[in-house]
Interface confidence: medium
């Protein structure tokens, strides 16, 4: 969380923006919330990048003001109009890129004065695993299988029974380029599986973290999986 | 009314450094992006930096990389361009000119220069 | 970094006539061009932007076109006050840069 206050000049406001990230190709938000103020016409909200002259996204006189933006950003911002004037300043930010990633600045006057703060915003791809027993193979095997990551990522397995095992000699794992030559298809597999086990692949780069669980009974497959940014510190 | 004002003439010394600076007036300051351009006598513009004020870092033509600074000062709303090293082919006008139309990318508001002139 | 060329290097016009000068990018710039107009002594002047745009408080006698690599500014009725050298500018690619500029005269 990063909170800012304001500039010299007029009375400083609170800013607070938290770090985030953004999954390629989809939608991202940019988080940012200030003190709000009783008229919507007195709030200008400017979106800056580090390095970009232009800007990112402006809302005053509760409208977009897009005149002034960037070209890499044209088109693909969006603030939450209706909750402007409760004090919600974040950036919805369509189709995300990996050039998206950077320092942003969310800055925001009201009639009560200024203040900005940064936001870290980095790129990449995540995207669930999702673990399978694989019954092509000669003996019992999982196949965990992720569509979609970058960086590229680590795969460790992980079981209950046998916690703190090293499973790196019994597994194989993968990745394939996908078609827009950015992102990879993660897929790992795990040899000698036992029965009445859970087993957990575990994918992880510096962006995401996701683990992908499946338990493997006479019975009945249970499967369950969650993914977690890494990122999210507020400022 | 925004308004570009720059400051005077110098004449300065081969191997020394000048700091021109750009009050803007009559608007935002912060988040408008500032860029300098220089243009030697007779000769066409030359684009070296440009500047964020809120953000403070600069970005810089490579040719002028190592040898120009662009700073910003908020409280004063002044933008300035250090050159150091200076050699007589860097006697030029120098200007100062803020980004506006589509996406700042065109530079809408010119400051009216400052010649400096480079002479032992 | 992209190159821009500006034809001719100086331009004869007799007031009233119509002038034509062009700007060409070494590489695509699409529309992202500029053009400047400058007098003796004085600081350019935004004239037209996105390669067909005219900026505030510019006469409709200047028009702009083409994208990619070529361009035109077009001064369909030169006035005596259009006697200056003009610079068209790309800022598709930073550094955004300008060409030599062209110099329109009285005939």
């Known amino acids: 969380l990063i909170i800012g206050f304001g500039i010299s000049g007029r009375h400083s406001i609170t800013v607070t923006t938290v770090a985030s990230a953004g999954n390629i190709g989809e939608d991202g938000i940019l988080s940012c919330t200030f003190e709000p103020d009783i008229k919507l016409s007195d709030i200008v909200i400017q979106w800056l990048k580090e390095g970009v002259l232009g800007l990112v996204h402006e809302f005053k006189e509760g409208k977009d003001e897009l005149s002034e933006q960037d070209e890499m950003f044209r088109g693909r911002t969006a603030v939450f109009a209706d909750q402007v004037i409760v004090g919600n300043a974040s950036l919805r930010l369509k189709n995300v890129q990996l050039t998206d990633a950077g320092t942003y600045k969310c800055y925001i006057i009201t009639s009560k004065g200024k203040g900005n703060a940064n936001l870290e915003y980095k790129t990449g791809a995540f995207s669930m695993p999702e673990v399978n027993v694989d019954y092509n193979a000669s003996s019992e095997t999982l196949r965990c299988e992720a569509p979609r990551w970058f960086p590229q990522p680590t795969v460790v397995w992980a079981s209950q029974v046998d916690q703190g095992a090293n499973f790196s000699e019994v597994s194989n794992t993968s990745f394939e380029l996908n078609s827009e030559n950015v992102t990879m298809k993660v897929v790992s597999v795990l040899y000698n599986v036992t029965i009445n086990n859970t087993y957990s692949c575990m994918i992880e780069n510096d962006i995401a973290k996701a683990t992908g669980d499946i338990k493997v009974t006479e019975s009945e497959i249970k499967r369950r999986s969650h993914l977690q940014l890494l990122n999210s510190k507020a400022s | 009314q925004v308004q570009l004002v720059q400051s005077g003439a110098e004449v300065k010394k081969p191997g020394s450094s000048v700091k021109v600076s750009c009050k803007a007036s009559?608007?935002?300051?912060?988040?408008?992006?500032i860029s300098w351009v220089r243009q030697a006598p007779g000769q066409g513009l030359e684009w070296m930096g440009g500047i964020i004020p809120i953000f403070g870092t600069a970005s810089y033509a490579q040719k002028f990389q190592g040898r120009v600074t662009i700073t910003a000062d908020e409280s004063t709303s002044t933008a300035y361009m250090e050159l150091s090293s200076l050699r007589s082919e860097d006697t030029a006008v120098y200007y100062c000119?803020?980004?506006?139309?589509?996406?700042?990318?065109?530079?809408?508001?010119w400051g009216r220069g400052t010649l400096v002139t480079v002479s032992s | 970094e992209i190159v821009m060329t500006q034809s001719p290097a100086t331009l004869s016009v007799s007031p009233g006539e119509r002038a034509t000068l062009s700007c060409r990018a070494s590489q695509s710039v699409s529309s992202n061009l500029a053009w400047y107009q400058q007098k003796p002594g004085q600081a350019p002047r935004l004239l037209i932007y996105?390669?067909?745009t005219r900026a505030t408080g510019i006469p409709a006698r200047f028009s702009g076109s083409g994208s990619g690599t070529e361009f035109t500014l077009t001064i369909s009725s030169l006035q005596s006050e259009d006697f200056a050298v003009y610079y068209c500018?790309?800022?598709?690619?930073?550094?955004?840069?300008f060409g030599g500029g062209t110099k329109v005269e009285i005939k």
């Open positions: 000119a803020r980004q506006q139309y589509d996406g700042r990318r065109y530079f809408g508001l």
């Open positions: 996105s390669a067909s």
């Open positions: 009559g608007g935002t300051f912060s988040s408008y992006a």
């Open positions: 500018q790309q800022v598709n690619v930073w550094p955004p840069t």
